[in-house]
């Protein structure tokens, strides 16, 4: 069988949801010594980067200026060390936002609920769309989808204090073109009667995977380059 290098890791810097006309930055983390990185969009070659010097850096950044719906979609990357190519990275969905209009978001029974109650978010957008998305801030990978002509429901619960946080919704014109975000709705979940509102909540971690962790090589890193890839893939 043909030998390949471990697959790289593709990430969006800061966020995979990019407002239209803004710049998107994608990182491809491969291996020290890689001489070429290729970014593929919807299966076709989109851009090429050659790190300088290749043996000193374990990845590259691809800058995508002037984001629009034609550049939104599925990206992947590969890299080359000498004549040997890597496996293809996982796919990354890059979304363009701030298209057209702004939806409104409401929550039932209200923004302050008690643990155990069921909650429904309603997202409304009058312009033609069929898919709606609900995201919790700090958990932007956990997208809930719902369908409707001008509005959609997102039932939740019974809620716990882990549901606390700020929520926004989007209307979607296709999988990769989203509206402006709604104004946030902050959900406050108080504990059971016995626990009161001081019940602890799960911390809302930022989207820590949406950062580019490209590192310059040290002597030790050079020896452990392949181990690094294995560990990164395990972490993912």
């Amino acid at each position: 069988p043909k030998q390949t290098l471990p697959k790289p890791i593709i990430r969006a810097e800061s966020t995979y949801m990019v407002p239209k006309e803004k710049q998107a930055t994608l990182c491809c983390q491969g291996s020290y010594g890689a001489v070429e990185y290729q970014l593929h969009f919807e299966g076709s070659l989109f851009a090429v980067e050659r790190p300088k010097p290749p043996e000193r850096i374990n990845g590259v950044k691809f800058h995508i200026p002037d984001m629009n719906s034609r550049k939104a979609g599925r990206y992947s990357c590969i890299y080359r060390v000498g004549e040997l190519w890597s496996e293809r990275s996982d796919l990354l969905d890059l979304v363009v936002t701030e298209m057209y209009d702004t939806p409104t978001l409401s929550v039932h029974p209200g923004p302050e609920v008690t643990s155990g109650e069921k909650v429904t978010f309603y997202c409304r957008l009058d312009t033609a769309t069929s898919m709606f998305l609900l995201l919790k801030e700090g958990r932007s990978r956990d997208v809930q989808r719902s369908y409707g002509k001008v509005q959609a429901e997102f039932p939740m619960g019974p809620v716990t204090t882990a549901h606390r946080g700020s929520y926004r919704c989007f209307g979607s014109y296709n999988n990769y073109a989203w509206s402006f975000p709604s104004e946030p709705v902050k959900l406050l979940v108080t504990g059971d009667i016995e626990n009161t509102s001081l019940a602890p909540t799960d911390p809302t971690f930022p989207d820590s995977w949406d950062t580019c962790l490209l590192t310059r090589e040290t002597g030790l890193q050079k020896d452990l380059a392949l181990w690094d890839h294995t560990a990164q893939n395990l972490l993912r």
């Epitope: 409104t104 008690t114 155990g116 109650e117 069921k118 409304r124 619960g157 009667i193």
Partner: antibody, heavy 115, light 107 residues
């Protein structure tokens, strides 16, 4: 304190439409859901639908789609239910109720459909 | 739609007696349940929300509880003004639905 003022009664002809009002005071009108419910004489309560004055989001009981239309006028803090093509089956007391958990209730409007 | 089966539909009891009314939910509603009181003139007042939380101004003789899909309203010691109609209401899943009601009569 919260008050939801509804007209006491209204008499309408079969086939006609009627718009019932619910004037809210004592709270921020745009921040709470407004529900409407129906109660036929000697019967239980049925939920018609609700509307959020801030977002305009509304949701209906399937049974009342085409029969009831919910609207709000935020400038006067008033919610409305429009009932169309009235028949004797629509003779009932109609209540408005504030808040997602039906916190407060109006006194109800008695609608009598009769020729 | 979620069905709320309320029992009994009517109940005769004496002053000072302890009574319980029950609503059974056909699907999971979590703690999203109210108990409402309706007077003969039609006035509706919420007594309990979120299964067991007492509204302000409601006497402590009223309490709410849950066991699985069964939700109960208990009046610990009946007073004359308690002999009216009671409804449960689930607000977990649209369309929100009411129980059929319980008429509490004085024995």
């Amino acid at each position: 304190q919260v008050q939801l003022q509804q007209p006491g009664s209204v008499l309408v002809r079969p086939g006609a439409s009627v718009k019932l009002s619910c004037k809210a005071s004592g709270y921020t009108f745009t921040s709470s859901w407004m529900h409407w419910a129906k109660q036929r004489p000697g019967q239980g309560l049925e939920w018609i639908g609700h509307i959020h004055p801030n977002s305009g989001i509304s949701n209906y009981n399937e049974k009342f789609k085409g029969k009831a239309t919910l609207t709000v006028d935020t400038s006067s803090s008033t919610a409305y239910v429009d009932l169309s093509s009235l028949t004797s089956e629509d003779s009932a007391v109609y209540y408005c109720s504030r808040g997602g958990r039906f916190d407060d209730w109006g006194a109800g409007t008695t609608v009598t459909v009769s020729s | 739609d979620i069905q709320m089966t309320q029992s009994p539909s009517s109940l005769s009891a004496s002053l000072g007696e302890r009574v319980s009314l029950t609503c059974r939910a056909s699907q999971d509603i979590g703690s999203s349940l109210n108990w409402l009181q309706q007077e003969p003139d039609g006035t509706i007042k919420r007594l309990i929300y979120a299964t067991s939380r007492l509204d302000s101004g409601v006497p402590k003789r009223f309490s709410g509880s849950r066991s699985g899909s069964d939700y109960s309203l208990t009046i610990s010691s009946l007073e004359s003004e308690d002999f009216v109609d009671y409804y449960c209401l689930q607000y977990a899943s649209s369309p929100w639905t009411f129980g059929g009601g319980t008429k509490l009569e004085i024995k």
